[in-house]
Interface confidence: low
């Protein structure tokens, strides 16, 4: 259905009206209710195309959850039954590297990606004859593209002979998975704001269907990188926005990830949360953090969904989610994707192809262990996919899922035909499963990553590692020179070393004051409206990071602009990554950095460290033999026992799993 105030063809410069035909082996016939697999004949620009569709069984489930709120703000949890949904993926017969994401709920609606063009299709409103409009995505009116992509000609294989049997869906999708050999799973959570909900006529079903459609489109784009999108939850702010959306895109993104960390993660585990907003930000279609997909505090993005189609909007969400997955903008780099603009072009709209640069950026993220949370195949109670043995997702009622019969031949633990464990097996997958057996309790499964982190161990009765926890925010680190913040000890020298190499260190305070008082791209305290904010003297240590003793120039897949400012006998070095207005700047001082006695940086301001809500008296609570973790439980030193570290034991916490195994004392940390 068209959105209120949005005429069906007003956004198109050109379109055709067609009548698709459902195809059976015997004859063409008028459409009938949807099924697991279906084929249609459609016409586009004088040509007939046969499209083969298969229900996207990995997308949604038995246990799909939608969160909404009543008038008084009470959370309502709904499990709509949409197992036999009408969202499909597929390909165009005889067209190499084509892909399709369509819904067949009330007519055909979706995207067809051919070699040289992408088409949108949707039912013609008020037609009783199954008429549809079909249009090139290039013919959708949008802001002029800012495109700096260098498109190399891609050698094209000749199309298969049309008489040849079409490839199976599995073969087709395998053929497209050329980037990384191991499938990654993004557990995506979508949040829809109040204004967008109002714009959809306050119809929760319509919002839900639109977001499922969106997830199907995203899956069809990401599959080329061997990434699957699994929609693990939807929240609609039916009663009012739960964050302040006043201010610039950066403010709203900051508010959203703070809300996510405080309220959403505890309710539903996920890898990335994307906020869908109606409100625009003066030409900024969205904003997201780069490379933060597995971060507790920053794995999110915001996306503006105003008067555009869901097909066009899908490329915006694909772009912002791409940032979370480590992808930088393509502009100014030698990138190609076989189209005139790629998803990660800073101004692209309606693109569906990821570029070679995006693939490389994502590969870098995985090599640097920034994508470890993408390896887990969603658990049955977290993945919303219609249960199906053989889809490599462990669905409700399954104990394991090794995939196709051929893949299952290589799996020693899982019975491929039933998706049950083999008789001798305790487990088939997970960090605490080895050779079909649970690893013994006390086996380290997630090591300590910094002085502000704590290790986790297998518990001996589960294939999964204990949930990740770290030292409580606000605990002193680096010999009292810094505070722990989200598992990292945040201090200036370490940040300088990440950017400028191991010998770099923080510049003197005067550097920060001098440079950050300017309010330009090299020295500022954030962005407000269309201009950089000057730092007040008291906030200068929370603006652009200033370093000295620089001997290496950073390379992060993109070449940043570097500025050197002489100040009182030293050179202050700063950096502008020029990532664009939709990406927070990694050249700024990190949140949680100690900017004075009892003070930390937050939102480019030097504020009282009490905002971290650190409330752990380690002497009283942990008897001086431990620290508090992010669940506010004691993590005891080796030699002392949880929960309060007052009796002898082997360290750890109630959250970490046992640190000791009676059978093997060598397993202790």
């Amino acid at each position: 259905a068209a959105r209120p105030g949005f005429q069906q063809t007003s956004h198109l410069s050109s379109y055709e009206i067609i009548t698709p035909w459902r195809l059976t082996r015997e004859r063409r016939e008028a459409p009938r209710p949807y099924s697991k697999q279906v084929s249609y004949v459609i016409q586009a620009e004088g040509k007939e195309h046969i499209i083969h569709l298969e229900r996207n069984k990995d997308l949604l489930p038995e246990d799909f959850v939608v969160y909404t709120y009543n008038k008084e703000g009470t959370l309502i949890t709904d499990h709509p039954n949409i197992q036999n949904h009408c969202h499909y993926r597929g390909y165009v017969e005889g067209v190499h590297n084509s892909s399709i994401a369509l819904s067949d709920c009330f007519g055909l609606r979706g995207l067809l990606h051919l070699e040289n063009a992408s088409y949108g299709i949707e039912p013609l409103q008020n037609s009783s004859h199954f008429e549809h409009i079909i249009y090139r995505m290039d013919d959708v009116y949008k802001e002029p593209l800012k495109c700096g992509v260098s498109n190399k000609d891609i050698e094209k294989e000749t199309a298969k002979d049309e008489e040849e049997e079409p490839p199976s869906m599995t073969q087709l999708l395998r053929r497209r998975r050329a980037v990384l050999p191991q499938t990654r799973y993004v557990e995506l959570f979508i949040v829809v704001d109040k204004e967008r909900y109002d714009m959809m006529g306050r119809n929760q079903t319509a919002v839900r269907e639109e977001m499922i459609l969106l997830a199907n489109y995203l899956d069809s784009m990401y599959i080329m990188l061997n990434i699957r999108i699994v929609l693990v939850g939807l929240e609609i702010w039916t009663n009012g926005n739960l964050i302040n959306i006043v201010g610039g895109a950066g403010d709203v993104l900051g508010n959203f990830v703070q809300w996510r960390e405080k309220f959403l993660i505890t309710r539903r585990r996920h890898d990335s949360a994307q906020l869908v907003l109606k409100k625009g930000f003066g030409g900024t279609a969205g904003m997201a953090f780069v490379g933060t997909v597995c971060s507790r505090s920053h794995a999110g993005g915001i996306n503006v969904f105003g008067q555009i189609t869901v097909e066009t909007f899908a490329s915006i969400v694909a772009h912002e989610l791409g940032h979370n997955l480590g992808m930088n903008h393509d502009d100014g780099r030698d990138c190609s994707c076989g189209a005139k603009s790629c998803i990660m072009n800073s101004g692209a709209s309606g693109s569906r192809n990821f570029s070679s640069c995006s693939a490389e950026d994502f590969e870098k993220l995985t090599l640097n262990k920034g994508g470890n949370c993408l390896l887990n195949i969603p658990k049955p109670d977290e993945a919303y996919s219609a249960p199906s043995c053989g889809n490599k997702l462990v669905d409700a009622g399954e104990e394991c899922d090794c995939g196709t019969p051929k893949e299952c031949e290589l799996d020693p633990c899982c019975e491929g035909s039933t998706c049950k464990l083999k008789s001798f097996a305790e487990c088939a997958y997970g960090d605490c499963c080895k050779d079909c057996r649970f690893l013994p309790g006390g086996t380290l499964c997630r090591g300590k990553t910094s002085e502000c982190d704590v290790p986790e161990y297998c518990n001996g009765s589960s294939q999964f590692c204990q949930p990740d926890v770290f030292i409580q925010n606000g605990y002193p680190c680096q010999n009292n020179k810094a505070y722990c913040y989200n598992g990292m000890c945040q201090y200036y020298d370490a940040q300088c070393q990440v950017i400028f190499g191991s010998k770099a260190k923080a510049a003197p305070k005067d550097c920060f004051i001098e440079v950050n008082s300017k309010g330009d791209r090299f020295g500022n305290c954030g962005f407000s409206g269309n201009e950089y904010k000057k730092c007040a003297t008291g906030n200068a240590l929370c603006g652009k990071l200033q370093c000295e003793n620089v001997q290496e120039i950073p390379v992060f897949g993109i070449v940043p602009a570097i500025i050197q400012t002489p100040s009182r006998g030293t050179k202050c070095w700063g950096v502008d990554f020029q990532l664009g207005s939709d990406v927070p700047d990694p050249g700024m001082v990190n949140e949680g950095t100690k900017c004075g006695a009892g003070k930390i940086c937050r939102n480019f301001q030097c504020v009282d460290a009490s905002v971290l809500n650190y409330d752990c008296d380690v002497q009283k609570k942990c008897h001086g033999h431990g620290v508090c973790n992010s669940n506010k439980n004691c993590h005891c030193e080796n030699g002392w026992a949880p929960p309060n570290c007052e009796t002898k034991g082997y360290g750890g916490s109630v959250d970490s799993g046992p640190t000791y195994n009676e059978m093997n004392t060598a397993l202790r940390d």
């Epitope: 008038k71 008084e72 703000g73 009012g240 926005n241 964050i243 302040n244 508010n255």
Partner: nanobody
């Protein structure tokens, strides 16, 4: 754009009472949860009391519980803060704020989109 106007502040003796009012210009107060916050010189702004849009839920900071009462009269398009047994430590600028967000975040100033200019309350001993 909703603008909030506070009134009723002033200078009183310890143990006295005051009634603050909050009225919106350009909006209907029944559409919003209303909160009162205060800021003493050199201190952070702190939550005082809040009332939900329907008036069925109220919440108070521990330091004012039992002494202050928040209420609303939607017919008069006004919210009130009745302050009894005032103490010197109640001295501050009192701000009225309105929120369209979920009421469970009543004590977090980030969730209030609309704010008044504030009214000074001074309690002498």
């Amino acid at each position: 754009e909703v603008q909030l106007v506070e009134s009723g502040g002033g200078l009183v003796q310890a143990g006295d009472s005051l009634r603050l009012s909050c009225a919106p210009s350009g909006g209907i107060i029944s559409n919003y949860h209303v909160g009162w916050f205060r800021q003493a010189p050199g201190k952070e702004r702190e939550f005082v009391a809040a009332i939900s849009a329907s008036g069925t839920s109220t919440a108070y900071a521990g330091s004012v519980k039992g002494r202050f009462t928040i209420s609303r009269d939607n017919a008069k398009n006004t919210a009130f803060l009745q302050m009894n047994t005032l103490k010197p430590e109640d001295t501050a600028v009192y701000y009225c704020a309105a929120s369209e967000y979920v009421f469970r975040y009543y004590d977090d100033s980030r969730y209030y989109a609309y704010w008044g200019q504030g009214t000074q309350v001074t309690v002498s001993s």
